[in-house]
């Protein structure tokens, strides 16, 4: 089984502190839900509300939980408040430069005057209705779930190339004399709550996670 991706491209630190707080509120709702037998979770799919029974233990398996997937009663803030820094210093995305996060050794936050090879943008997506699963099949993503009368929306932290036509031009800072280059959005698979028939089920779905530079060596011209 694939592992859930947790690394974030340089400069795009996921607001972990905010994620932790909201995850805590989800856990509280689940604790309450477990006290009721066979808790009903209302799943709103394509504008309709269907009451489906979901075992709250569905949310209990943390092993494959990705920081790129968030269940929240409110839209996630892109930048963390200073009080959030108690949880994790510098948990701001995409560009709070005043603090360094725990991830910054491998994924430094950009500073003024620093460049990325490819321009990218990161955003919490809260209106995903369909996605491609790990088998290449289109699946229906659960927009929101109702747990113990609290509606939790499913958000995905996505990073993509800012330029929609990045193949038209090269990457920044690449020696174009010897290299062909272009920027492209890459993907990973994260575990998300989806509809499987009439049941809610966890599936690996594909989301945008980085904008990377693709290089190929230019053919050497012989005299």
């Amino acid at each position: 089984e694939p592992h859930s991706e947790s690394n974030v491209p340089a400069g795009h630190t996921i607001p972990q502190a905010h994620w932790t707080k909201l995850q805590h509120s989800l856990d509280t709702a689940l604790r309450r839900a477990r006290s009721a037998p066979a808790a009903a979770i209302a799943a709103r799919v394509a504008g309709q509300t269907r009451n489906i029974t979901v075992d709250p233990r569905l949310f209990k398996k943390r092993r494959l939980r990705s920081p790129r997937v968030l269940f929240s009663t409110q839209p996630p803030r892109e930048a963390a408040d200073t009080q959030d820094l108690d949880f994790e210093v510098g948990g701001a995305a995409p560009f709070n430069r005043t603090h360094r996060s725990k991830r910054s050794s491998s994924h430094p936050i950009f500073h003024r005057g620093e460049f990325s090879v490819c321009d990218s943008v990161s955003v919490w997506v809260g209106d995903k209705t369909t996605a491609t699963d790990i088998k290449g099949k289109e699946v229906m993503v659960l927009g929101e779930v109702n747990i113990n009368n609290s509606v939790f929306k499913q958000y995905f932290f996505e990073t993509k190339c800012r330029d929609p036509n990045p193949v038209d031009s090269g990457c920044r800072g690449i020696d174009s004399k010897h290299w062909n280059s272009y920027c492209t959005t890459t993907h990973t698979f994260v575990k998300a709550l989806t509809m499987d028939g009439k049941q809610a089920a966890w599936r690996f779905i594909r989301i945008d996670t980085a904008c990377v530079c693709v290089l190929s060596r230019k053919a050497v011209r012989r005299a």
Epitope: F95, F110, R112, F115, D119, V121, N165, D168, R172
Partner: antibody, heavy 118, light 111 residues
């Protein structure tokens, strides 16, 4: 000192052409995204167009098909070629440098006035 | 297309007042939002980038907040030098910008 200086503005008749220049100093234009922004008299800022570090260009609908953004890395200069000019193109034209990663406009030129009138 | 809507268009205030200007994006732009100050006959000057980061050299009475679609510029105590026009700008998208990357502007005038 990092600086942008526009030139080439002036009075032009409707239907005419004009080429604006934006000379950069203190940095090389080749690694940056650069934009042209205009401001009609008494109006707000209007984004005209953009050239990426990889020379991809994008234009506002009002500029599409009439305006062309280019740059000459050897001269460290950005250009705005304006054709088929109309009275509504009358404005102060600014060039600006986009900051990497945050995509704001940190460096601006002083502006050059373009007047389209018969 | 992303539309940027700024309000109010004009604001009358006195020195020492706390002033708040809002900017709304028609779709989420994360925190790719900047605020500028412009005085007559001058080029715009960057105040805030990344929705809440103060540009170097800008007085700390200026602050920015918000993310997603709702953003705010606050001047905690208005100074004589602050009477100007303020613009927000989204940096999230560069294509399909038929609706301008800038808000319509807010003129802060003396009451």
């Amino acid at each position: 000192e990092v600086q942008l200086v526009e030139s080439g503005g002036g009075l032009v008749q409707p239907g005419g052409s004009l080429r604006l220049s934006c000379a950069a100093s203190g940095f090389t234009v080749s690694g940056y995204n650069l934009v042209w922004v205009r401001q009609a008299p008494g109006k707000g800022l209007e984004w005209v167009g953009f050239i990426s570090y990889g020379d991809t260009t994008y234009y506002a609908s009002s500029a599409k098909g009439r305006f062309t953004i280019s740059r000459d890395n050897s001269k460290n200069t950005l250009y705005l070629q304006m054709n088929s000019l109309r009275a509504e193109d009358t404005a102060v034209y600014y060039c600006a440098r986009e900051t990497a990663n945050t995509y704001d406009y940190g460096i601006w030129g002083q502006g050059t006035l373009v007047t389209v009138s018969s | 297309d992303i539309q940027m809507t700024q309000s109010p268009s004009t604001l009358s205030a006195s020195v020492g007042d706390r002033v708040t200007i809002t900017c709304q994006a028609s779709q989420t732009i994360s925190n790719y939002l900047a605020w500028y100050q412009q005085k007559p006959g001058k080029a715009p000057k960057l105040l805030i980038y990344g929705a809440s980061n103060l540009e170097s050299g800008v007085p700390s009475r200026f602050s920015g907040s918000g993310s997603g679609t709702e953003f705010t510029l606050t001047i905690s105590s208005l100074q004589p030098d602050d009477f100007a026009t303020y613009y927000c700008q989204q940096g999230y998208t560069i294509s399909n910008v038929d609706n301008n990357v800038f808000g319509g502007g807010t003129k802060v005038e003396i009451k």
